[in-house]
């Protein structure tokens, strides 16, 4: 056979469909690889050919379009299953060709099973709802093109094993599910089952999505730097380790990039000729507010380092903030002696205990690891 532009196996399109349900799969050539659509190709005399490779086989075979009740059919650039079977799983290829042109792409199709509570290996889309924000809706996804607008399907919504009925704040409204007010308890997997008739048969489409209730933009604030702060002084002797945590709270903001960084004397740590390491940890609240901690560490601090300016910066879509850490060189404690011996240098003991940092205005001392949460 003559040469064909082979786009290979398009693993980006990991198509998953439920067993015993209709599936319509568009040839990815027109979606992602070619600059023209099927209608243009068809009117230019190009033919779309489908074939497949079964799971765990190497042999490419034609798709059988002569099955009872037209179980598998092709319509324009769409491959139809009415319905799927488990052993339809495999790699499918669509090839567009005529005598002078050929282009093809393969994609994996996985037919998956679900249990009575709609659990399955299906990857679920996530829909975020704002907490206590007023009415918000989710819509039953990917059901377009399965039935004409003249057909009125029945739609049933479930949360896990349970039909959504008599819920306090969740109301099924056809293809939409309305949340009158969203709470944390509304987190979970929601399934719509769309039932429609076709040629004397009844088909079901099952679509599950995950709802995640997140912080509301009404409550969103610019980043808040909890540490460093005005109450903590990082007082060190040369040769000691300097550890300064920068802990920043970010309100949840849809599609916002949260950033935290240190500057030393106004420069990025990488641009300073000292041995600095920065470790970052991130934690999230139940509503996806974020706390980022970046710990700046200098293993053996020099007196030069103790004169530098250490500033923590934070930025989100809500704004940018910065806070300098108060770093000082520890003044050696005066040596008090008691005539006649026997006594201990009580003041000296106090200074020894005050090894790491002063909390101004308090008289308490805390070792640095208390501030790394």
């Amino acid at each position: 056979s003559e040469r064909c532009d082979d786009w290979g196996l398009d693993t980006m399109r990991q198509i998953q469909v439920f067993e015993d349900e209709p599936a319509r799969i568009k040839c990815p050539l027109f979606e992602h690889f070619l600059k023209f659509n099927y209608s243009t190709a068809h009117s230019a005399g190009l033919t779309l050919i489908w074939y497949w490779t079964r799971q765990d086989r190497d042999l490419e075979e034609p798709i059988n379009f002569r099955l009872p009740e037209n179980r598998i059919s092709k319509e324009k650039d769409v491959l139809w299953f009415r319905p799927t079977l488990l052993n339809d799983t495999g790699n499918y290829t669509c090839m567009l060709r005529n005598t002078t042109y050929c282009s093809k792409v393969a994609f994996p199709l996985e037919v998956v099973q679900k249990d009575s509570c709609f659990n399955s290996p299906m990857k679920l889309p996530v829909h975020k709802l704002y907490i206590e924000y007023g009415i918000q809706r989710i819509t039953c996804p990917n059901v377009d093109g399965y039935f004409p607008s003249s057909v009125k399907p029945t739609i049933t919504w479930y949360m896990g094993c349970y039909k959504i009925q008599n819920f306090n704040n969740v109301i099924p409204e056809g293809m939409n599910l309305s949340f009158l007010i969203a709470f944390i308890s509304n987190n979970g997997n929601y399934t719509c089952v769309v039932t429609y008739p076709e040629n004397g048969r009844t088909f079901h489409l099952t679509r599950t999505l995950t709802v995640k209730v997140v912080g509301s933009p009404k409550n969103a604030v610019p980043p808040v730097i909890h540490s460093p702060n005005d109450h903590v002084v990082y007082e060190k002797e040369p040769g000691e380790e300097l550890l300064i945590p920068c802990t920043v709270y970010f309100s949840f903001l849809m599609d916002s990039r949260n950033e935290v960084w240190w500057t030393i004397d106004g420069k990025k740590p990488d641009d300073i000729p000292i041995d600095v390491t920065i470790n970052e940890s991130i934690s999230h609240s139940r509503t996806e507010d974020e706390t980022r901690t970046q710990i700046l560490s200098i293993k053996k601090v020099t007196s030069e380092d103790l004169k530098r300016s250490y500033v923590c910066h934070a930025r989100s879509a809500k704004g940018e903030v910065a806070k300098a850490a108060t770093v000082k060189q520890k003044v050696p404690a005066p040596r008090y002696t008691v005539e006649g011996g026997g006594g201990t240098g009580g003041l000296n003991d106090i200074f020894e205990a005050q090894k790491i940092e002063w909390h101004e205005g308090g008289g308490h001392h805390h070792h640095h690891h208390h501030h790394h949460h």
Partner: antibody, heavy 122, light 107 residues
Framework: QVQLVQSGAEVKKPGSSVKVSCKAS????????IQWVRQAPGQGLEWMGY????????DYAQKFQGRVTITADESTSTAYMELSSLRSEDTAVYYC???????????????WGQGTLVTVSS | EIVMTQSPATLSVSPGERATLSCRAS??????LAWYQQKPGQAPRLLIY???TRATGIPARFSGSGSGTEFTLTISSLQSEDFAVYYC?????????FGQGTKVEIK
């Protein structure tokens, strides 16, 4: 360890109502359903209905529609099953049961209460 | 609603012997079937779900099989504590329904 503790035995007159309580200890963070099942003396198990306390959702078996009301008080982790217009054939042990989540197929009756005997007699 | 029919109503077995209990659904319930054990004066206890998966803490002598409309619970070697009533339950369709039970008694 999750436990369900039910209220004590009741003797009721025909035509009256009974309200059985079921208190959960060690409740999980995520929503769950409380099921109600009854068992007449020497008979099998009969599902009556459920409630999802944190979400308010409920449903009843067709046979009990109009006579049963299942409610819950989230603040005390207690569910209630009220059966009205009692007749002698409602004499049974009434059980509450629950699973850990709303999603575990076949495991919605993981944990059971000890049962409450309701006797309907004139 | 789906009707679950268990057989036999009573099964007389000697300790150490194998017991086989049947459950039939009036229509396919796929693998959405559970088995429960109930001893006198006690609440039921979940043994098997998903037709063949043992619940937490259930001994390996209990096994379930089947799918669609025909299901079996097998107790490979009956212990004295296994003499009880066993119920099957389908959770494929609402309302979830139980069988009428099989009593396993000492022969």
């Amino acid at each position: 360890q999750v436990q369900l503790v039910q209220s004590g035995a009741e003797v009721k007159k025909p035509g009256s109502s009974v309200k059985v309580s079921c208190k959960a200890s060690g409740s999980p963070a995520e929503p769950y359903a409380i099921q109600w099942v009854r068992q007449a003396p020497g008979q099998g198990l009969e599902w009556m209905g459920y409630i999802i306390p944190s979400l308010g959702g409920y449903d009843y078996a067709q046979k009990f529609q109009g006579r049963v009301t299942i409610t819950a008080d989230e603040s005390t982790s207690t569910a209630y099953m009220e059966l009205s217009s009692l007749r002698s054939e409602d004499t049974a042990v009434y059980y509450c049961a629950r699973g850990q989540t709303l999603y575990a197929a076949g495991r919605q009756f993981d944990i059971w209460g000890q049962g409450t005997l309701v006797t309907v007699s004139s | 609603e789906i009707v679950m029919t268990q057989s036999p109503a009573t099964l007389s077995v000697s300790p150490g012997e194998r017991a086989t209990l049947s459950c039939r659904a009036s229509q396919s319930v796929s693998s959405n079937l559970a088995w429960y054990q109930q001893k006198p004066g006690q609440a039921p206890r979940l043994l098997i779900y998903g037709a063949s998966t043992r619940a937490t803490g259930i001994p390996a002598r209990f096994s379930g099989s089947g799918s669609g409309t025909e299901f079996t619970l097998t107790i490979s070697s009956l212990q004295s504590e296994d003499f009880a009533v066993y119920y099957c339950q389908q959770y494929n369709n609402w309302p979830w329904t139980f069988g009428q039970g099989t009593k396993v008694e000492i022969k």
